[in-house]
Interface confidence: low
Amino acid sequence: ELCDDDPPEIPHATFKAMAYKEGTMLNCECKRGFRRIKSGSLYMLCTGNSSHSSWDNQCQCTSSATRNTTKQVTPQPEEQKERKTTEMQSPMQPVDQASLPGHCREPPPWENEATERIYHFVVGQMVYYQCVQGYRALHRGPAESVCKMTHGKTRWTQPQLICTGEMETSQFPGEEKPQASPEGRPESETSCLVTTTDFQIQTEMAATMETSIFTTEYQ
């Protein structure tokens, strides 16, 4: 069951998922000048059995002009290992969620993918909040939100996070502070349905998110 609306907006905060529940869809979007190959997958789908989850389908982009430069990247073990270091551990999350049954890791990038990753979350998905750069967590209960089904309707639980002040960036629990931050993160923009997340992947992954559908920018 897809979540009908977006996770709650917290002023001066962004969110991200650390792993994706089975049933989550990721649109196969290509950057400008490229498009999905004809008959290519429209989306990747997190599927699996009781012991293993993975993304079904593979996104492939080809040049809009030549239409014959189809390439696809399958991550090498080293790349996969490197990506694993960007997943954050949390006191509120004793188990690495990405290794939990029924969850998929962040899919590796594919060649010429769009700067925006659009995810479609399902009931049971958890997202984690952090204060944007220049703000710190003044009060923290659980800084997370879960998409739940109640009386036949989906809703997101309210995270207990207040971000305040012009101080050092609050990181996700257990996440090291990046060596250098490019520029201040903008506040989340409200979008009725799609919300996006802007990831700048440096040594660590600093996150900027907006709502229930997610964007990732690879530099």
Epitope: D4, N27, E29, R36, I118, H120
Partner: nanobody, 127 residues
């Protein structure tokens, strides 16, 4: 589900132009193909134009091809139909509709493929 509300209709002289807008609410809008249909007095509902969720594909009825342009703004949750060189036979109530199936690669021209509909906006072309 996607809630839809059309606007932009009105009375226009033959040869004139109109831009119809369809405002959508509901976060699934981004992933659904969208279409415009019309119903003239005493006639069946007729397909006008459709656009895919990712704006890759557009489809037009022969009756409006070359005179109309469908577009969408996913950020603003809007679908548009720009109609030029209007003719009296374009007089109808115009409806915006959302495809049943998200992320569909096929842009449908049949009304049965759409399950969310707006209330419609009246377009009257005088000769």
């Amino acid at each position: 589900q996607v809630q839809l509300q059309e606007s932009g209709g009105g009375l226009v002289q033959a040869g004139g132009s109109l831009r119809l807008s369809c405002a959508a609410s509901g976060r699934t809008f981004r992933t659904h193909n969208m279409g415009w249909f019309r119903r003239a007095p005493g006639k069946e509902r007729e397909f006008v134009a459709a656009i895919s969720w990712n704006i890759d594909n557009k489809l037009y009825a022969d009756s409006v091809k070359g005179r109309s342009t469908i577009s969408r703004d996913n950020g603003g949750n809007m679908v548009f139909l720009q109609m030029n060189s209007l003719k009296p036979e374009d007089t109808a109530v115009y409806y915006c509709a959302a495809d049943k199936i998200p992320l569909s690669s096929d842009v449908a021209a049949t009304a049965t493929e759409y399950d969310d509909w707006g209330q419609g906006t009246q377009v009257t072309v005088s000769s």
